[in-house]
């Protein structure tokens, strides 16, 4: 004889008064059973769209819409998609360090400005958050070279660039 | 299926140089970081620093700056790093791991299966 | 700089919840993504967690992972602990969006 809550699977729920288990009403959802009220579906609007539609047994999961990117815990919020010379941390935009560039819109990581000293090359012109440095044409000379060593913002960490 | 072979296990003399290699398979392998990681026996991960195999730009810890050297060859897909004048402190686990591009500050979502480097006289 | 602080050890019974926790020294925890690997002997670590609360194809719902503000934390929290879930776990954060920062590891026992 079922006199508990306890048996109840997910997606019901169950009062103790009387220890029934009852389907989730439509548009409501428990991922424990035996609660007694079932959870009301998140709905995804405005900014947001389903990623993941509810059941009776989940939430619904919320995404951006094109042009926007998540923030937050489940996607509590959208923010715009970063611009060029950016990069997405999960503090929203945040501009490339010191030594890193980023040429996509909207999508992509900082990453090192080429070292242009791997290919015997000089630096023809130096690098931007934006865009990569440009390499000139193999060195051919045997003048001394200098090493600057570029730390990226907020930590450890060189880069090295071969400046002739 | 994304998978990251390193090479083999190496035992080293105090004062030589160890060079592990990491095989990249099935994605982009210039578009995603590599990052480099050892594990000291019975202690904790430590970051000894990446490389973004499209250009070769690389970063590297404090701690492993003029010591390590990261490349990458492109036509394997293999990134290398190299580890000079070893000690016997350099005796560890050597990972070598991917970054995905989604944000500055992420996971790593595949790892090589580590490559045991002993440092001994 | 940043630190992610973890306790060694950590022991449970099976069928219990397991919290593991992770302090940042620095900084607020909401400004950080959280990443959680599990590691067992002899073998690569596996992502259990990312950015804070997700979980990778194939980890079961038992992983689940959240922060606390108040106490400048992430935590990784295993329900229904099973004796295949013994394992070092460890926290990963970033101190730069280049330099990557570990917690120590806390070695799960499961009773």
């Known amino acids: 004889v079922q006199n508990s809550c306890d048996n109840c699977q997910p997606g019901t729920f169950c009062r103790k008064y009387n220890p029934v288990c009852k389907s989730c009403p439509p548009s409501t959802f428990s991922s424990i059973g035996g609660q007694p009220n079932c959870n009301i579906c998140r709905v995804c609007a405005g900014y947001f769209r389903f990623k993941k539609f509810c059941s009776s047994t989940h939430n619904a999961e919320c995404e951006c819409i094109e042009g926007f990117h998540c923030l937050g815990p489940q996607c509590t919020r959208c923010e715009k998609d970063c611009r060029p010379g950016q990069e997405l941390t999960k503090q929203g935009c945040k501009t490339c360090s010191l030594g890193t560039f980023n040429d996509q819109n909207g999508t992509g990581v900082c990453r090192p400005w080429t070292n242009c000293s791997l290919d015997g090359r000089s630096v023809l012109k130096t690098g931007t958050t934006e865009k990569d440095v440009v390499c000139g044409p193999p060195v051919v000379s045997f003048s001394p070279s200098t090493t600057i060593s570029v730390t990226p913002e907020g930590g450890p960490g060189g880069h090295s660039l071969q400046v002739l | 299926e994304v998978q990251l072979v390193q090479s083999g296990a190496e035992v080293k003399k105090p004062g030589s140089s160890v060079k592990v290699s990491c095989k990249a398979s099935?994605?982009?392998?210039?578009?995603?970081?590599i990052y480099w990681v050892r594990q000291a026996p019975g202690q904790g991960l430590e970051w000894i620093g990446n490389i973004w195999p499209g250009n070769g730009g690389t970063f590297y810890g404090e701690k492993f700056m003029g010591r390590a050297t990261f490349t990458a060859d492109t036509s394997t897909s293999t990134a290398y790093m190299e580890l000079s004048s070893l000690r016997s402190e350099d005796t560890a686990v050597y990972y070598c791991a991917r970054r995905p591009d989604y944000s500055g500050d992420d996971y790593f979502d595949y790892w090589g299966q580590g490559t045991l480097v002993t440092v001994s006289s | 700089s940043v630190e992610l602080t973890q306790p060694p050890s950590v022991s449970v019974s099976p069928g219990q919840t397991a919290r593991i926790t992770c302090k940042l020294n620095s900084g607020n925890i909401g400004s950080y993504y959280v990443h959680w690997y599990q590691q067992k002997p002899g073998q690569a670590p596996v992502t259990m967690i990312y950015r804070d609360d997700k979980r990778p194809d194939g980890i079961p719902e038992r992983f689940s992972g959240s922060s606390d503000s108040s106490s400048n934390s992430a935590f990784l929290t295993i329900s229904g602990v099973q004796a295949e879930d013994e394992a070092d776990y460890y926290c990963h954060s970033y101190d730069s969006t280049i330099t990557p920062v570990f917690g120590g590891g806390t070695k799960l026992t499961v009773l």
């Open positions: 099935g994605y982009t392998f210039t578009s995603y970081y």
